[in-house]
């Protein structure tokens, strides 16, 4: 039977969402509760480390939300963005693999605002490379496991 | 030759889209016309049943649209949402695997409004489990086969 | 060792983005620089040609953006759309496999506007068929390789 291919589906750790409106790397993800799982990949410091060379499909789903019960937004014009970043440890460097998002005007008479971003793509990854997620406005993240997550699964070897 | 892996790509049955603005389960999908297809999975009562344990990539694309020729919207503040739901028959329970969407203000001087949601993720599914799609505001769904669909394909066995 | 499965990840050629606001086919993509890559598929005239029958997962990520420094928008009501199109050469015909997007009001006091679309789905493709990308408002496309791309990878054979 062939060796199980690497995969991960990581869900946001609600207890460790940073505050702020600047772009931040999300550094705390679950890997073993609810829908979260990992196999033949490693999670360290919020980065998903590749242990096996290959072509992988990477994806991320990021939800932002605000309800007026938590107060008002200090600015009505928001950039709600996600960046899927590849870091090479051997040659310390970071590169955006995928980005998505939208500018939003969350003023108005609505008591609730919501917006989700989904990105996905097929990438060549080498053992030792790491995938991380950066977002703007982390304090607006939806902490549900069905809302804010990212993942990867190996599709094929590098020939 | 290895047994063909399970997959499905299901497109909305335009004739059976429910009306209303509340959250509903979409219960009628095509599986054998146009782009719709299914293999080693079963469609029953709008739910996609898993017949083979495995890790699957699940996805959904949901489009909402409104043209002023069809009349005015009852409310200008809309929550346009999709939920991908897993139901276990053995232990009757439902859980959201993925969600996406946006709040929208579809007032204004534009005669046409459109919005699409895409979600995707990698999940462990057991034989007998079912996947279904819930949406808000089903009366605004775009009934085209390229617009509103969901699907799954098996990536690997559970070891 | 099994033959490497076909795949492609194609990123927008910034130098060849057409102008205008009408729906156009994007005809220039990179296949061999940065994240762009192709194997056992062919790129010709901006169309991704299938060389091997199979079931493929197709995806596209399209980002639109506008900064006031580049001038004013001629219209504040925009339809920002993507269509993933399959063309059969044997029987000359085109069909939309997937679509996504949103209507947007990019007026207001914000100096920067951004919006991304992601679509993905599982399709049966035959050798000789071609996949292309159509967008509205191509002059608003974000030319970054992490922003505007599409791709495909073969998941399994047609039995």
């Amino acid at each position: 039977k062939p060796e199980a291919q690497p995969f991960a589906h990581l869900t946001i750790n609600a207890a460790s969402i940073p505050s702020g409106s600047h772009k931040v790397t999300l550094s705390s993800w679950y890997h073993d509760r609810g829908w979260a799982k990992i196999s033949n990949m490693t999670l360290s410091n919020g980065k998903l480390r590749v242990n096996q060379d290959g072509f992988y499909y990477l994806y991320a789903n990021i939800c932002f939300r605000h309800h007026e019960t938590s107060g008002d937004l200090a600015t009505e014009y928001l950039q709600l963005m996600v960046y899927v970043v590849k870091t090479s440890i051997k040659i310390p460097s970071s590169h955006n693999l995928m980005k998505g998002g939208s500018t939003k005007n969350w003023s108005g008479n609505s008591e609730f605002h919501f917006y989700s971003i989904n990105v996905g793509g097929f990438f060549k990854l080498r053992a030792g490379e790491e995938i991380s997620i950066q977002v703007s406005n982390p304090s607006l993240l939806d902490p549900d496991q069905d809302a804010t997550y990212f993942g990867a699964f190996k599709v094929q070897d590098i020939d | 030759k290895p047994e063909a892996q399970p997959f499905a790509h299901l497109t909305i049955n335009a004739a059976s889209i429910p009306s209303g603005s509340h959250k509903v389960t979409l219960s009628s999908w095509y599986h054998d016309r146009g782009w719709a297809k299914i293999s080693n999975m079963t469609l029953s009562n709008g739910k996609l049943r898993v017949n083979q344990d495995g890790f699957y990539y699940l996805y959904a694309n949901i489009c909402f649209r409104h043209h002023e020729t069809s009349g005015d919207l009852a409310t200008e503040y809309l929550q346009l949402m999709v939920y991908v739901v897993k139901t276990s028959i053995k232990i009757p329970s439902s859980h959201n695997l993925m969600k996406g969407g946006s709040t929208k203000n579809w007032s204004g001087n534009s005669e046409f409004h459109f919005y699409s949601i895409n979600v995707g993720g990698f999940f462990k599914l057991r034989a007998g489990e079912e996947i279904s799609i819930q949406v808000s505001n089903p009366s605004l769904l775009d009934p085209d086969q390229d617009a509103t669909y969901f699907g799954a394909f098996k990536v690997q066995d559970i070891d | 060792k099994p033959e490497a499965q076909p795949f492609a990840h194609l990123t927008i050629n910034a130098a060849s983005i057409p102008s205008g606001s009408h729906k156009v086919t994007l005809s220039s993509w990179y296949h061999d620089r940065g994240w762009a890559k192709i194997s056992n598929m062919t790129l010709s005239n901006g169309k991704l040609r299938v060389n091997q029958d199979g079931f493929y997962y197709l995806y596209a990520n399209i980002c639109f953006r506008h900064h006031e420094t580049s001038g004013d928008l001629a219209t504040e009501y925009l339809q920002l759309m993507v269509y993933v199109v399959k063309t059969s050469i044997k029987i000359p015909s085109s069909h939309n496999l997937m679509k996504g997007g949103s209507t947007k009001n990019w007026s207001g006091n914000s100096e920067f506007h951004f919006y991304s679309i992601n679509v993905g789905g599982f399709f049966k493709l035959r050798a000789g068929e071609e996949i292309s990308i159509q967008v509205s408002n191509p002059s608003l496309l974000d030319p970054d390789q992490d922003a505007t791309y599409f791709g495909a990878f073969k998941v399994q054979d047609i039995d």
Epitope: G20, S21, H66, T69, S70, G71, A74, T75, S139 | - | -
Partner: antibody, heavy 126, light 103 residues
Framework: QVQLVQSGAEVRKPGASVKVSCKAS????????IHWVRQAPGQRLEWMGW????????KFSQKFQGRITVTRDTAASTAYMELRSLRSEDTAVYYC???????????????????WGQGTLVTVSS | EIVMTQSPSSLSASVGDRVTITCRAS??????LNWYQLKPGKAPRLLIY???SLQSGVPSRFSGSGSGAEFTLTISSLQPEDIATYYC?????FGQGTKVEIK
């Protein structure tokens, strides 16, 4: 330590305007929002509006919309609240209060008023 | 618009007594509720934020509890300096106040 010091008591005739100042010290003024809250004799506290001292964004209670202006001078670390078309029922003690949310760390104005000014009595009488 | 209702509107208790003030919201507000102390001629003081978090510098005899639509402020052992009017607050809405006096 954090302090908000308001301008002194004012007496106005109906129809006139009043402008109350609130000088902040002991923290980075631009990183917080300032709220204005009033209390009329025998009444509950009443929220009037806020200003994000960093970007100047404002939000007001519907009740005061069109009559209130809130501004700030970041160089002077001072917020101002002007109320126009005064009537007798505007007689109240007017407070400025700092929102506890640091705008560097977040973008939610949380309505936790962690520091208050001493209050300014505005009397409207003919 | 959310309405906050406090009870009682006033109370009289002895030094050392345990005092409880209730605040109800007209709809669920999760834990977004604050308590303030107001003494005549002085600046109001934040006691409790987020329903149960004690503001820095506030004596530990003050505590808050509750979530959803029902909340309480408790003074475990009333002191003479606690004579004041207490207000609950959720974002833009304040309760009508509870006046606490010493018997």
């Amino acid at each position: 330590q954090v302090q908000l010091v308001q301008s002194g008591a004012e007496v106005r005739k109906p129809g006139a305007s009043v402008k109350v100042s609130c000088k902040a010290s002991g923290y980075d003024f631009s990183n917080y929002a300032i709220h204005w809250v009033r209390q009329a004799p025998g009444q509950r506290l009443e929220w009037m509006g806020w200003i994000n001292a960093g970007n100047g964004n404002t939000k007001f209670s519907q009740k005061f919309q069109g009559r209130i202006t809130v501004t700030r001078d970041t160089a002077a670390s001072t917020a101002y609240m002007e109320l126009r078309s005064l009537r007798s029922e505007d007689t109240a003690v007017y407070y400025c209060a700092r929102d506890s949310s640091n705008m560097v760390r977040g973008i939610i104005i949380a309505y936790y008023f962690d520091y208050w000014g001493q209050g300014t009595l505005v009397t409207v009488s003919s | 618009e959310i309405v906050m209702t406090q009870s009682p509107s006033s109370l009289s208790a002895s030094v050392g007594d345990r005092v409880t003030i209730t605040c109800r919201a007209s709809q669920s507000i999760s834990r977004y509720l604050n308590w303030y102390q107001l003494k005549p001629g002085k600046a109001p003081r934040l006691l409790i934020y987020g329903a149960s978090s004690l503001q820095s510098g506030v004596p530990s005899r003050f505590s808050g509890s509750g979530s959803g639509a029902e909340f309480t402020l408790t003074i475990s052992s009333l002191q003479p300096e606690d004579i004041a009017t207490y207000y609950c607050q959720h974002t833009r809405a304040f309760g009508q106040g509870t006046k606490v006096e010493i018997k």
